[in-house]
């Protein structure tokens, strides 16, 4: 897996931002803004929530999600799982790449208390051309979107 | 926004560290150590808390702040906002780039006395020459400084 | 400390993952998987928990650890310290590079409550050839390992 960084080539990078349409409630991955505001794609493409690799190599991939709620009502998961997952044509299921579990709801000591928490993930993974990376949050009802600065997803080749 | 990485050029990077003078209490951004210990500037400059871009491009910018306190009295901020903000000559106000909100004080149970929390932000943004990036924390009274390893601010071109 | 990125050279990078053998209980640093699954070494080597630098330069180093427990048993530290430390032949003691302190146990409001928390660290440091970077967690008994996706350690040259 020798990888060279050519001086005349653009280094692939992307930063995608949270938007009102990010949370589908369908059980699928989060969706992202790719063009407006701070969002961009350079040497990577996007499809249905996924960053799609066009050039094989090692990538630092990252995501942050803003979590929040009022109190801790029954029925809401006490554990939040936030992860980056790979989809590859060579394997039928998504593969976990980087995952965090948090119990932010436990911070609220009374039923009316507003709480906030943030989960950040980042790490280097090898990705082949055509492979896709997505973000999932379970329970996504606790993800708080606003203006693209609090929940986001990105990558760059290293 | 095609960006080339020339093989003969130094890749801009910086890592600034927290110091006793970081917290001004003035409502301004946090200030940073730029030379001593782990701190350095390479192809970026510094002014009044800001990393100043000399070469336009995409940068991975990051910051971590160490939060801590004793007990959780009413009157101390229940929500902490930690963010990276851009100042540009083309716009009069700071622009939010990456932001987190946390409720760390809720971690202190009725008996647990001292609480600690950490907030990490990182992401890729496009910055033009002359633009500046700063770190803000509200309520900054809860930021815990020690030796530059717990609260810091950095960037590198990708 | 002028550093050039040669176009014909492979850029050093590594991502090491948590494994059943990571937690030694010996007071030493965490140990890591270097080959299986998502783990790899490219232009860096590994020895006894340490990433070993072969080429001097500025590196973005990072680590995430997954913390978790059931309630907050007596005898467990209420403060968790997660850090990246440098070992250099020029100095007898480890040097703190990036450190976080958290009080995750305070999130559990009842003695039987399961809680999860995650700690992420990342930042740019200068490393000389032969220097080593390790990860330490105190109290490591609260680190939760599973499949290499929740606790990890990596670096790449910037």
């Amino acid at each position: 897996l020798i990888q060279e960084r050519r001086s005349h080539e653009v280094n692939p990078a992307a930063h995608l931002t949270g938007a009102n349409s990010s949370l589908t409630g369908s059980g699928g991955p989060l969706l992202w803004e790719t063009q407006l505001g701070l969002a961009f794609l350079r040497g990577l493409s996007y499809h249905d929530g996924a960053l799609v690799v066009t050039k094989a190599g090692y990538y630092y991939i990252y995501s942050k999600v803003q979590l929040g709620g009022v109190g801790c009502p029954l029925g809401l998961a006490s554990t939040i799982t936030h992860g980056l997952y790979k989809r590859t044509p060579r394997y039928p299921e998504e593969l976990e790449l980087l995952v965090s579990q948090q119990s932010p709801c436990g911070r609220a000591t009374s039923s009316s208390r507003v709480w906030w928490d943030s989960s950040f993930l980042g790490g280097v993974v090898h990705l082949e051309a055509g492979e896709k990376v997505v973000v999932r949050v379970l329970d996504e009802r606790l993800v708080r979107l606003r203006d693209g600065t609090r929940s986001y997803f990105g990558a760059f080749m290293v | 926004l095609i960006q080339e990485r020339r093989s003969h050029e130094v890749n801009p990077a910086a890592h600034l560290t927290g110091a006793n003078s970081s917290l001004t209490g003035s409502g301004g951004p946090l200030l940073w150590e730029t030379q001593l210990g782990l701190a350095f500037l390479r192809g970026l400059s510094y002014h009044d808390g800001a990393l100043v871009v000399t070469k336009a491009g995409y940068y991975y910018i990051y910051s971590k702040v160490q939060l801590g306190g004793v007990g959780c009295p009413l009157g101390l901020a229940s929500t902490i906002t930690h963010g990276l903000y851009k100042r540009t000559p083309r716009y009069p106000e700071e622009l939010e780039l990456l932001v987190s909100q946390q409720s760390p004080c809720g971690r202190a149970t009725s008996s647990s006395r001292v609480w600690w929390d950490s907030s990490f932000l990182g992401g890729v943004v496009h910055l033009e020459a002359g633009e500046k990036v700063v770190v803000r924390v509200l309520d900054e009274r809860l930021v815990r400084l020690r030796d530059g390893t717990r609260s810091y601010f950095g960037a590198f071109m990708v | 400390l002028i550093q050039e990125r040669r176009s014909h050279e492979v850029n050093p990078a590594a991502h090491l993952t948590g494994a059943n053998s990571s937690l030694t209980g010996s007071g030493g640093p965490l140990l890591w998987e270097t080959q299986l699954g998502l783990a790899f070494l490219r232009g860096l080597s590994y020895h006894d928990g340490a990433l070993v630098v072969t080429k001097a330069g500025y590196y973005y180093i990072y680590s995430k650890v997954q913390l978790g427990g059931v309630g907050c048993p007596l005898g467990l530290a209420s403060t968790i310290t997660h850090g990246l430390y440098k070992r250099t032949p020029r100095y007898p003691e480890e040097l703190e590079l990036l450190v976080s302190q958290q009080s995750p146990c305070g999130r559990a409001t009842s003695s039987s409550r399961v809680w999860w928390d995650s700690s992420f660290l990342g930042g740019v440091v200068h490393l000389e050839a032969g220097e080593k970077v390790v990860v330490r967690v105190l109290d490591e008994r609260l680190v939760r390992l599973r499949d290499g996706t929740r606790s990890y350690f990596g670096a790449f040259m910037v």
């Epitope: - | 801590g68 004793v70 009157g75 647990s112 006395r113 | 209420s78």
Partner: antibody
Framework: QVQLQESGPGLVKPSGTLSLTCAVS?????????WNWVRQPPGKGLEWIGE???????NCNPSLKSRVTISVDKSKNQFSLKMNSVTAADTAVYYC???????????????WGQGTTVTVSS | DIQMTQSPSSLSASVGDRVSITCQAS??????LNWYQQKPGKAPKLLIY???NLETGVPSRFSGSGSGTDFTFTISSLQPEDIATYYC?????????FGGGTKVEIK
């Protein structure tokens, strides 16, 4: 430099209420510090009673909680202790003391009043 | 409540001697421990905070060490003015609790 001064009756009848006030001078009670009460029975060690923050948030020793009320008066820059249903076992020197800052992470009791002796007797 | 066990309860030493007092917590309290000096008829005085940090203005012959459950307070060279009772105090958990005290006397 902050100074603390306790005041209140030196003698309280059994089953009565002990009332003490601590005046803060040289600084504001509205700082981020916690303000504490500690007592010391004759010839014995120190016992923490409780604390208050300027916003009114309080914490008390569970062994005394049902009998103790701590309050703050920001306009007078003082805080107070009330303990009801006292017995001879509550005879002690009572100290007011400044604790660590809520916006801080150490909790040394760094400023103390000179103490006031309260005797519970009929 | 966290129990703080101090030993010895009293000691007698000569001027110039090195004196050590230990404090053991009933559970891990990290470094959340303070040491106080109380002279007869006076209020306690904070000497050491966070297990090992010297309060401003306190002579350097006083020191503290330890973490977790076991802590030590040391006077490197006992002076006549050091005659007092010394207390440890934890603040890892509420209620704040003190050790039983160690009375230091001059031989």
């Amino acid at each position: 430099q902050v100074q603390l001064q306790e005041s209140g009756p030196g003698l309280v009848k059994p089953s009565g209420t002990l009332s003490l006030t601590c005046a803060v001078s040289g600084g504001s009670i509205s700082s981020t510090h916690w303000w504490n009460w500690v007592r010391q029975p004759p010839g014995k060690g120190l016992e923490w009673i409780g604390e208050i923050y300027h916003s009114g948030s309080t914490n008390c020793n569970p062994s005394l909680k049902s009998r103790v009320t701590i309050s703050v008066d920001k306009s007078k820059n003082q805080f107070s202790l009330k303990m009801n249903s006292v017995t001879a076992a509550d005879t002690a020197v009572y100290y007011c003391t400044r604790g660590g800052a809520a916006a801080g992470t150490n909790y040394g009791l760094d400023v103390w009043g000179q103490g006031t002796t309260v005797t519970v007797s009929s | 409540d966290i129990q703080m066990t101090q030993s010895p309860s009293s000691l007698s030493a000569s001027v110039g001697d090195r004196v050590s007092i230990t404090c053991q917590a009933s559970q891990d309290i990290s470094n959340y421990l303070n040491w106080y000096q109380q002279k007869p008829g006076k209020a306690p005085k904070l000497l050491i905070y966070d297990a090992s940090n010297l309060e401003t203005g306190v002579p350097s012959r006083f020191s503290g060490s330890g973490s977790g459950t076991d802590f030590t307070f040391t006077i490197s060279s006992l002076q006549p003015e050091d005659i007092a009772t010394y207390y440890c105090q934890q603040y890892d958990n509420l209620p704040l609790t003190f050790g039983g005290g160690t009375k230091v006397e001059i031989k």
